[in-house]
């Protein structure tokens, strides 16, 4: 039961995380105009990975896409790439994990295969989360660098009559969404990897014997030897005598003729 719960929770957490990564990638507020100590501004600028926007005090908002590819900063391109890789890996991970879920039966899929798929999706989620965290962190670092550079040059032409105020940008909501989402995807991935260990016990290969203390007769569980997954420390073929005691997870893990739909 614990394995199913861990796997299910890992899947849900990863699903929320990937949805968050997608949301963060699409959001326009990666960087927002620093308002200093002034909460009300006549013209408010904010930028995303794909377009920049201006919101006026009149309520009018205008957004312009970055229609150039070569003219964009390399760092922005790198952030875009990291976020897209994170989304793609996460999406594949979700697809794989759906089939790996213990509560879903697909044909005669064995536990070893489910364990492998759970591990694969877990690793994918971990890499996806790391990609998102890396992408957001790179962008945040870029903002911090630019912020202090523009602070140093806050006013140009101070010697003359004319002043030009440089627009400073600070962290937008998308960065926090991205960090949280990346973290959730990472946690979900770790949970999937933990669940994988439970799905593939140390002694995976068995010829199960069901013992009943009440009588002399011994019922043999059909199924023969199972292929080794390699997750256990002992990969030799052994007969497992379980004395009639089984956990709910173990009961679920033995395929029988009743499993096929």
């Amino acid at each position: 039961m614990a394995v199913t719960a861990c796997q299910g929770l890992g899947f849900v957490v990863s699903l929320i995380g990937i949805a968050g990564i997608i949301a963060a990638t699409c959001m326009d507020q990666w960087s927002t105009q620093d308002l200093y100590n002034n909460p009300v501004t006549a013209v408010f600028n904010y930028q995303g990975l794909w377009r920049s926007c201006v919101r006026e005090s009149s309520g009018f908002t205008e957004c312009r896409g970055y229609f150039t590819l070569l003219g964009l900063p390399a760092m922005l391109q790198a952030v875009r790439a990291l976020m897209i890789v994170g989304i793609v890996l996460g999406a594949i991970g979700l697809l794989v994990s759906i089939f790996a879920l213990k509560c879903i039966r697909i044909g005669s899929m064995e536990d070893s295969a489910k364990a492998n798929m759970t591990l694969t999706s877990g690793i994918m989620f971990i890499v996806s989360g790391l990609c998102a965290i890396a992408g957001v962190s790179v962008f945040a670092n870029m903002l911090v660098t630019n912020f202090w550079m523009s602070t140093a040059n806050m006013y140009t032409g101070m010697g003359g009559m004319v002043q030009t105020v440089q627009t400073r940008y600070t962290f937008g909501a998308a960065l926090f969404v991205g960090w949280v989402a990346g973290g959730l995807t990472l946690i979900g991935g770790v949970m999937m990897c933990i669940a994988c260990r439970g799905l593939a016990p140390e002694e995976t290969n068995y010829k199960a014997v069901s013992y009943h203390a009440s009588g002399h007769s011994v019922a043999y569980k059909p199924g023969g030897f199972k292929a080794s997954t390699g997750f256990g420390s002992n990969t030799k073929n052994k007969k497992i005598y379980d004395g009639g005691a089984r956990t709910e997870d173990e009961v679920q893990s033995y395929p029988s003729k009743h499993d096929y739909v």
């Epitope: 009300v40 013209v43 009149s58 627009t167």
Partner: antibody, heavy 115, light 113 residues
Framework: EVQLVESGGGLVQPGGSLRLSCAVS?????MNWVRQAPGKGLEWVAW????????TYADDFKGRFTISRDDSKNTLYLQMNSLRAEDTAVYYC???????????WGQGTLVTVSS | DIQMTQSPSSLSASVGDRVTITCKSS????????????LTWYQQKPGKAPKLLIY???TLESGVPSRFSGSGSGTDYTLTISSLQPEDFATYYC?????????FGQGTKVEIK
Amino acid sequence: EVQLVESGGGLVQPGGSLRLSCAVSGYTFSMNWVRQAPGKGLEWVAWINMYTGEPTYADDFKGRFTISRDDSKNTLYLQMNSLRAEDTAVYYCARSSMGNGFDYWGQGTLVTVSS
Amino acid sequence: DIQMTQSPSSLSASVGDRVTITCKSSQSLLNSGNQKSYLTWYQQKPGKAPKLLIYWASTLESGVPSRFSGSGSGTDYTLTISSLQPEDFATYYCQNAYSFPFTFGQGTKVEIK
């Protein structure tokens, strides 16, 4: 079509108070009060976000004037306290539009501060 | 606060003349986010409310005749009336629409010669 109709102007003694109203019909996201002293130029007084009620004022009017709105009546207000002779002017309400320009104006209401 | 300085304060012109009014701001009105200058021009006739002519320094408000045009960027802006018409005799104001507090120029009165 947006229509703005001001009211509430009149004669008031120095140190007195007055509340101007601007009845708004049509879509407005944000509104302004602008005044014009006799024979002088335009002077921006205050701005308000009609949805959040968030205001901002010109430095000369902070603390004395309060801009507000009533959602149910779709009305804009300017509460003026501690009035001085130099506050004598025609007060206009105006709607903010693209480029933060003021595209619709009321007809104006005259406020005279005199003893 | 941004100071707006208009010149000339008044001018005399005849119908058909080309008229240019300049406006200078103490700070750039160009917004880096959309590369637009937040300068607005108004026309006001005696006893009437002002009328919006131009926003974003050069965008003509709907219903405004095409003889009116605006130009400029940064701190220097101009309003041009290509061929002055009888109804154009009025006072013209420029306005900083870039940052609060919004500030107006002192106005330019266009009179009949």
